[in-house]
Interface confidence: medium
Amino acid sequence: AGVFELQIHSFGPGPGPGAPRSPCSARLPCRLFFRVCLKPGLSEEAAESPCALGAALSARGPVYTEQPGAPAPDLPLPDGLLQVPFRDAWPGTFSFIIETWREELGDQIGGPAWSLLARVAGRRRLAAGGPWARDIQRAGAWELRFSYRARCEPPAVGTACTRLCRPRSAPSRCGPGLRPCAPLEDECEAPLVCRAGCSPEHGFCEQPGECRCLEGWTGPLCTVPVSTSSCLSPRGPSSATTGCLVPGPGPCDGNPCANGGSCSETPRSFECTCPRGFYGLRCEVSGVTCADGPCFNGGLCVGGADPDSAYICHCPPGFQGSNCEKRVDRCSLQPCRNGGLCLDLGHALRCRCRAGFAGPRCEHDLDDCAGRACANGGTCVEGGGAHRCSCALGFGGRDCRERADPCAARPCAHGGRCYAHFSGLVCACAPGYMGARCEFPVHPDGASALPAAPPGLRPGDPQRYL
């Protein structure tokens, strides 16, 4: 087991004429993110298969707004590595696809939209545990610079992450025939279980006594290189080191086929066999098809039998966009009326209505007072989606059914005693106080704090609260 790591260094216009404009419109700011897809082996079939070794998506890069008229600079990139964990042996040879995606960030309904900006592909040999390998790939007028490596996750080591390391049993050295596990010098190689003599560089095993070869090697111990077309070429002098014939200059030298295309000579020139998703004389044109899995979120892809025919994504409920990349925000159009709360449940839209409103979209204004009687002579008042009773004197509660206790709030001041009365309350004041609520002291000279007592009442008499 281990991890393939990809570091994007830059994405911008390639050299030469026809530099692209910024990928962000003057209208819409955007930001970039990357997707990597890994497949084992170098064969043509590998380019069309799913991402059998794994895939990863980067974080979103910083927001970029185009300065109108300016050429595209190197665009701001997401932080960090793209990491693709692999569970089994690292195959040594692999195919990759790196996609640059743009996320548009206007105020568009439905939120940000994604679109594929560029796509590069290639096939490489890579030993696990080695240094970072640097690469440059072009897609149309764009250029992507990146580095990659494969590293083993402990306890696995070796070029295929198939040898295992274990902590030392003795503090000083490893057991007989077992080497220290560089770079983990405090650990030792676990006893080899592969077939005796199985090449540690080009072979691996998953079962004891087995010897399985990495791509490009053959033989019972994986020590024999597989013949390649360059070794069989009739041109050029023989190479002393490999026994292969080194080809002289030819139309395929330097591989004119972009994006991982393979070159074959024709009588007059060369021909590129392009991986799925690319076409053109030099495989320089990207044309995404259903085989590339362009539909997100479980969308069904239809069409795209040949590279330059369009594909259509049929999106599952709750998603939209040409790649089903956008979650439908059905609440953004504010379908719930009268202040209702919108809930997007994915399979359906639900409105939670405020009191006094009903209907699927809270469109019905309920007659708050309809069928609601206020008891004991109270009158119904509509308002704010809820009914309220204005109660007659001596009654209270939601429907005026409760007889009010006017003395409950202790309205009589200065120790006055409260008596409930059919029309309200009466305060019997303590000596020295007067007033409807016994609020006024009676002065010692007999004059009250009031200018005059109401007719028919003497100071000190119970005062009826009118």
Epitope: P20, R21, P23, S25, A26, R27, L28, P68, G69, E104, G106, D107, Q108, I109, A113, S115, S322, S332, L333, Q334
Partner: antibody, heavy 117, light 107 residues
């Protein structure tokens, strides 16, 4: 339902001013970028001006032909966008539409502006 | 400014036909292209944005495609209510410019 309703059009003399208004409803106006687009038989559809939302500092942009002459503004509290047009010329005659969102998702019915003696 | 050209100014088709309207930009507009429908009463509606994305509420018989400088709008099964003038518009670069329109009529 999204609604955009333009008003303020009519007949003016060359050199005069006019202010168009667009009342919006049915969507979160403060989130939306708003534009004015005009249409005339001579020039067809022609983008005039753009005002972005608060998140984009209410940035404004204009077509070269109206720069310095027209001013776009908005009042988020009233869900309205305006186009103040000064020093009008016969070439400014046309139907003026207001549109909502950065992908020009919704358009009003338009208001006719005629500049003539 | 980017020029948008709709070479066909008017088009006659029968109900049920598949109709394609094309639009060409004077430079690469990197898919920032909208299609609008204008009815005889002046009502304008967005049909397709960003080359191929169907605006909400637009029937699925409308579709858009293209890249670089060449774009097209297709109506797969022409219906009576599709009688209108169709405009393309680029919003890749200011000023956002429109095509001259293609008027679609019934044979």
């Amino acid at each position: 339902e999204v609604k955009l309703e333009e008003s303020g059009g009519g007949l003016v003399q060359p050199g005069e001013s006019m202010k168009l208004s667009c009342a919006a409803s049915g969507f979160t106006f403060s989130d939306a970028w708003m534009d004015w687009v005009r249409q005339s038989p001579e020039k067809g559809l022609e983008w005039v001006a753009e005002i972005r939302n608060k998140a984009n500092n209410h940035a404004t942009y204009y077509a070269e032909s109206v720069k310095g002459k027209f001013t776009i503004s908005r009042d988020d509290s009233k869900s309205r966008v305006y186009l103040q047009m000064n020093n009008l010329r016969a070439a400014d005659t046309g139907i003026y539409y207001c549109t909502a969102y950065s992908n020009f998702a919704y358009w009003g019915q338009g208001t006719l502006v005629t500049v003539s003696t | 400014d980017i020029q948008m050209t709709q070479t066909t100014s008017s088009l006659s088709a029968s109900l049920g036909d598949r109709v394609t309207i094309s639009c060409r930009a004077s430079q690469n507009i990197i898919n920032y292209l909208n299609w609008y429908q204008q009815k005889p009463d002046g009502t304008v509606k967005l049909l397709i944005y960003y080359t191929s994305r169907l605006h909400s509420g637009v029937p699925s018989r409308f579709s858009g495609s293209g890249s670089g400088t060449d774009y097209s709008l297709t109506i797969s099964n022409l219906e009576p209510e599709d009688i209108a003038t169709y405009y393309c518009q680029q919003y890749s670069e200011r000023p956002y410019t429109f095509g001259g329109g293609t008027k679609l009529e019934i044979k």
